[in-house]
């Protein structure tokens, strides 16, 4: 007789990440009677939505519904019918809706409350949208990449089943790059974490973790690009800014409303006598690398270390997998490479910075200006966070690894996100039952 | 279970104002919305607007000139406003707790009728 | 406004018998469609969301069909309590708009 294959019973999940620049959805999938063990849930689907962050949709929220649709309806296609009811949806928005809500709590409730309505409108048990704290999103990045390289789990083996993992239990560090902010989570060794609010105590599968994490908000390389112009405009002569982070040759008019606008440079605000300015790109990686680090305060520190800005920083500990746009940066500017030492990677930024926008343009043909036109800032901005912010030095920038995914689910804290409002991340480690791995029938 | 209760006049004088109160149970207004539909003979069942579970509103270009939907999320009760009533406002109104914009639970109705 | 055209103002059945109300759409609606059972004097009562998932509670003979901008409510193997009228109504866009109903009669 002919071996029928048993109906598989398996679960799945959908989180929306709203980030500030955009909104990506995540479907992920895990067996049913293994919810518990680790490493179980996996990405089965990313779809990016077409637009920017739910935060620009202040003045236009009728337009939510359908910016949602195809990333929604997409799921409906990947996920079966007869689960669609089933599957949980959550929505976690990050920075950009943190700093809408310091803006107007009211114009933030009236996002989240139109984005509510339309996700409701589909056949999925939808769970609820909420701005995640700044804590959560670095925990639970923390918690994905953790999970995925297998370091929760007990069992030692004697072969590797993910590439970075060094075979021990020794959790990896995440730091984590948004639009808005930044995040950088990691467990100190054996060192008091002074500051009580950058504290976070876990138990899972049966271990304690003492965990130190810090939400840097207006540091997400967007944010920190336009903080760094609001600084640089104040002592411009004129209305043409020169400016090092950008290609020799590259010109963009910047309006004054538009770099006021967000809260993150109210403090460089100033009555400019013009409403545009234009950036001149000068292209020098020095130069800029020096005006990125007029954005860190490092005058001021309560603690026995920080890292910026009068916030606690233990000393760094064990490797750390940097994602998000840590990882799609350097992926670009092709220094993700564990190989590539950080005088190397500062190197190759100089001669990248250093290039014509014309040359820029040609070579990368097919890539958004917009996008393109930042990448010297950004992959500068990178390097100044992490050597200067977050005190990584030549010798321990070898322990950063640039992640993009970790056996096919992103790195980010949409996983974790899930995995803890599902309860599949348990505090004592499950009991091993027989026939756990194949079940013979 | 789920319960909407709704209470308000039967009677309303021309160009008079309607209130009325929809008191729910069995969930919160914090997880749910609440929509309003009036259903007469002549117009079938009409979408009035809606009340979302952050406060915020949507209206019936319609009405949106002399309707008001606010709440008390503490007292898990909608309150619904409508100005200048005339003799064509004269239906039964609806309250409906709702996730999105299927009306997933009725009120039992509240019988309006517009007379002097 | 998008208009809901339910065409059979009233429609005729038998116990057992399996029917079929339909309703259609003035523009693409997706599948943004509910449908709801009116009995007399009672409230409308949700059975159908997402033109096609039913609401937990509702009988198996009660399927929804249809995408864009046709969209049928089936009854198979109707029974004597399934005698009431029937709505749908469209949530693709504002203002939300209801089908005008069809009664349904048992012979």
């Known amino acids: 007789t002919q071996n029928k294959a048993l109906p598989e019973n398996v679960k799945y999940g959908i989180v929306l990440d709203a980030g500030s620049s955009h909104t990506s959805l995540y479907i992920y999938k895990w067996p049913a009677e293994k919810e518990n063990d680790t490493g179980v849930v996996h990405q089965v689907e990313e779809c990016r939505v077409k637009g920017p962050g739910i935060s620009k949709f202040v003045q236009k929220v009728n337009e939510i519904g359908i910016y949602l649709t195809d990333c929604m309806e997409r799921a409906r296609e990947v996920i079966p019918r007869s689960q669609h009811q089933e599957t949980p949806v959550y929505l976690g928005a990050t920075a950009g809706m943190r700093l809408l809500r310091m803006e107007s709590e009211e114009l933030a409730d009236r996002v989240l409350d139109v984005v509510e309505r339309s996700l409701s409108n589909y056949p999925f048990d939808f769970q609820g949208a909420r701005i995640i704290t700044g804590q959560e999103e670095g925990a639970y990045g923390w918690i994905t990449i953790n999970y995925l390289l297998g370091k929760f789990s007990q069992k030692t083996r004697w072969f590797s089943i993910v590439p970075y993992e060094t075979n021990n239990q020794e959790t990896f560090g995440a730091l984590d790059l948004g639009g808005a902010s930044t995040q950088v989570t990691f467990v100190p060794q054996n060192q008091t974490i002074e500051s009580p609010d950058n504290a976070l105590q876990f138990r899972l599968y049966g271990k304690d973790y003492n965990v130190y994490t810090h939400s840097f908000l207006c540091y997400g390389k967007d944010q920190a690009l336009w903080q760094k112009l609001a600084k640089d405009i104040q002592v411009a002569s004129n209305e043409i800014l020169r400016d090092p982070c950008f290609h020799p040759g590259y010109k963009k008019v910047v309006n004054v409303s538009d770099l006021y606008k967000t809260p993150c440079t109210k403090r460089f605000e100033m009555t400019l006598p013009f409403q545009q300015f234009e950036i001149q790109g000068i292209g020098n990686y020095q130069q800029c690398h020096q005006s990125i680090l007029e954005l860190f305060n490092t005058s001021y520190c309560p603690y026995s270390q920080c890292a910026f800005n009068g916030i606690f920083l233990p000393p760094l500990q064990g490797d750390f997998g940097a994602f998000s746009a840590f990882y799609f940066v350097m992926k670009f500017l092709n220094l993700t490479s564990e190989k590539v030492s950080q005088e190397k990677v500062t190197e190759m930024m100089k001669k990248f910075c250093a290039q014509p926008w014309e040359e820029i343009k040609t070579s990368y043909a097919g890539v958004k200006e917009k996008y393109l036109s930042e990448y010297c800032f950004s992959g500068t901005y990178i390097l100044s966070l992490l050597l200067q912010g977050y005190h990584f030095t030549a010798d321990s920038w070898e322990h950063i690894h640039f992640i993009g995914k970790i056996q096919g689910s992103d790195a980010g804290w949409t996983l974790g996100y899930m995995l803890n409002l599902t309860n599949m991340i348990p505090a004592e480690q499950p009991l091993s039952t027989p026939l756990s791995h194949s079940t013979y029938v | 279970q789920v319960q909407l209760k709704q209470s308000g006049p039967g009677l309303v004088q021309p160009s008079q104002s309607l209130s009325i109160t929809c008191t729910v149970s069995g969930f919160s207004l914090t997880s749910y919305g609440v929509h309003w539909v009036r259903q007469s003979p002549g117009k079938g069942l009409e979408w009035l607007g809606v009340?979302?579970?952050?406060?915020?509103?949507d209206y019936n270009a319609a009405f949106m000139s002399r309707l008001s939907i606010t709440k008390d999320t503490s007292k898990s009760q909608v309150f619904f406003k409508m100005n200048s009533l005339q003799t064509d406002d004269t239906a039964i109104y609806y309250c409906?707790?709702?996730?999105?914009?299927?009306?997933?639970?009725w009120g039992q109705g509240t019988s309006v009728t517009v007379s002097s | 406004d998008i208009v809901m055209t339910q065409s059979h103002k009233s429609m005729s059945t038998s116990v057992g018998d399996r029917v079929s109300v339909t309703c259609k759409a003035s523009?693409?609606?997706?599948?943004?469609v509910a449908w709801y059972q009116q009995k007399p004097g009672q409230s409308p009562k949700a059975l159908i969301y997402s033109a096609s998932y039913r609401y937990s509670g509702v009988p198996d003979r009660f399927t929804g069909s249809g995408s864009g901008t046709d969209f049928t409510l089936t009854i198979s193997n109707v029974q004597s309590e399934d005698l009431a009228e029937y709505f749908c109504q469209q949530y693709n866009s504002y203002p939300l708009t209801f089908g005008g109903g069809t009664k349904l009669e048992i012979k």
């Open positions: 009340i979302w579970r952050r406060g915020s509103t």
């Open positions: 409906a707790g709702v996730r999105g914009d299927a009306m997933d639970y």
């Open positions: 523009q693409n609606v997706g599948t943004n």
